[in-house]
């Protein structure tokens, strides 16, 4: 089955139209947007949910603003262009023929350009920074029980091998949750850090994108651990083009 | 065609080493996890560990505290279980196993290897 | 670590029968639960992932079901090659993934 058994639904993606339409009857979905197949048992790719998002009802909302070489997603949601698995297309264009670069999250990672603008590959995310301050609690969670919740969140809500999970810092209030995976380390199942990020970041924000599954009650030895901000920092293996205009 | 061929059979002496070899074929060896499951004789598979051949990265089960040690060779294509401090209950087919990343299913199997440990 | 616990521990069944394992998880593993087939003397051989998807050669016969912590694997209509034994495999949390005991199935 490529979802649910029963009720043919998508537990991991919610924005998809599902109907036993599959080989043998078996329930097959389809991304919203892109009319896309997904596989219901993994994430599916951030620029697949993206542009699912744009093709349904919407508030907009504006992300974070960006810090030195490392990118933040300031320019909010955009409708992508997705390649047949789903990825990024390396050059993404508006409406209005103004186009730019991206990274492998879907990050702009150059000046905005025209048509003739060229995108040579997909840079790939290999490190993702998620800045995280929780609410005040009682005391600060002990780092090491912190540390295995949030490893044991990722490779079961997000399906993310903890291997590819580099580090969890904590400095009370703050949790830093670093992510690092290159091309070669990934191997066949394993799930992309900028997928896993983008699902844990709408579910920090009351937007799970989870099918009938409640929302993310993250606990760390009984105490809830509630996010009151978060920030995401994402890293390339090849350095963004911005020019000295944009950086003063 | 994906094949799995491993090492022969090992009798050992209690407190010794063994080390078993897997060499992989018909498939990109560094493009899927490897485990290594073993079964003594009359019971039920036992998951050992597993690495990326790509980076080397391993996870263990902590039953082995430190006893299985798991490493691979890019150049062939190959990747060895090492267990050491073994003892009468260690005796066992060792197999390894091709894995995914995702459902944690196990779609390719070695022939096993049989390691007695006797004294 | 998750405990996987399998009944029955052996079955006698005829040719033609169906025959139903069930295979139960100490705690949830939402839908990452595998199904292997054993012959004496041979490695184990994947039937079924992720609960219902049937790998690639494995006769339609074959199939699975369930979420959560209670699954099953049945066998439509039991063919002589079937008889083996039966383990169920969990592959949702941290390492170590765990195996059930084992079913044995038995020519009745």
């Known amino acids: 089955h490529t979802a649910a058994q029963d009720n043919c639904t998508c537990p991991t993606n919610k924005m998809t139209v599902c109907s036993p339409d599959g080989p043998g009857g078996r329930c097959q979905c389809r991304a919203l947007g892109s009319g896309m197949a997904v596989d219901c048992s993994t994430l599916t790719s951030k620029c697949l949910l993206l542009k699912a998002r744009m093709s349904a009802p919407k508030n907009a909302r504006t992300l974070v603003r960006p810090s030195e070489h490392a990118l933040v997603d300031n320019d909010g949601l955009y409708d992508p262009d997705c390649d047949p698995e789903g990825r990024f297309k390396a050059r993404q264009c508006n409406q209005t023929s103004v186009c730019w670069c991206v990274n492998s999250v879907g990050v702009r990672r150059t000046d905005k350009g025209d048509l003739s603008l060229r995108c040579d590959e997909l840079v790939r995310t290999h490190h993702i920074l998620i800045d995280l301050r929780h609410r005040p609690t009682a005391g600060a969670f002990n780092h090491s029980d912190l540390d295995a919740e949030l490893r044991r969140l990722f490779r079961e809500r997000y399906r993310l091998h903890p291997k590819f999970v580099a580090a969890v810092h904590y400095e009370q209030p703050t949790i830093q949750i670093e992510l690092r995976q290159n091309t070669s380390q990934k191997a066949a199942g394993d799930v992309d850090i900028g997928d896993a990020a983008y699902y844990f970041e709408r579910d920090i924000k009351g937007e799970s994108l989870f099918q009938g599954r409640g929302g993310l009650d993250l606990r760390v030895r009984g105490e809830p651990l509630q996010v009151e901000r978060t920030l995401i920092y994402y890293l390339d293996e090849i350095p963004p083009k911005f020019s000295m205009k944009r950086l003063t | 065609q994906v094949q799995l061929v491993q090492s022969g059979a090992e009798v050992k002496k209690p407190g010794a080493s063994v080390k078993v070899s897997c060499k992989a074929s018909g498939y990109t060896f560094t493009s899927y996890w490897m485990h290594w499951v073993r079964q003594a004789p009359g019971q039920g598979l036992e998951w050992m560990g597993e690495?990326?051949?790509?980076?080397?990265?391993?996870s263990y089960n902590q039953k082995f505290k430190g006893r299985v040690t798991i490493t691979r060779d890019t150049s062939t294509s190959t990747a060895y279980m090492e267990l050491s401090s073994l003892r009468s209950e260690d005796t066992a087919v060792y197999y390894c196993?091709?894995?995914?990343?995702?459902?944690?299913?196990?779609?390719?199997w070695g022939q096993g290897t049989l390691v007695t440990v006797s004294s | 670590d998750i405990q996987m616990t399998q009944s029955p521990s052996s079955l006698s069944a005829s040719v033609g029968d169906r025959v139903t394992i069930t295979c139960r998880a100490s705690q949830d593993i939402s839908n990452y639960l595998n199904w292997y087939q054993q012959k004496p003397g041979k490695a184990p051989k994947l039937l079924i992932y992720?609960?219902?998807r049937l790998q690639s050669g494995v006769p339609s016969r074959f199939s699975g079901s369930g979420s959560g912590t209670d699954f099953t694997l049945t066998i439509s209509s039991l063919q002589p090659e079937d008889f083996a034994t039966y383990f169920c495999?969990?592959?949702?949390?941290?390492?170590?993934?765990?195996f059930g005991q084992g079913t044995k199935l038995e020519i009745k």
């Open positions: 992720y609960t219902s």
């Open positions: 690495i990326t051949p790509s980076d080397g990265y391993t």
């Open positions: 196993a091709r894995g995914h990343g995702n459902y944690v299913s196990f779609d390719y």
């Open positions: 495999q969990q592959g949702y949390t941290l390492p170590p993934y765990t």
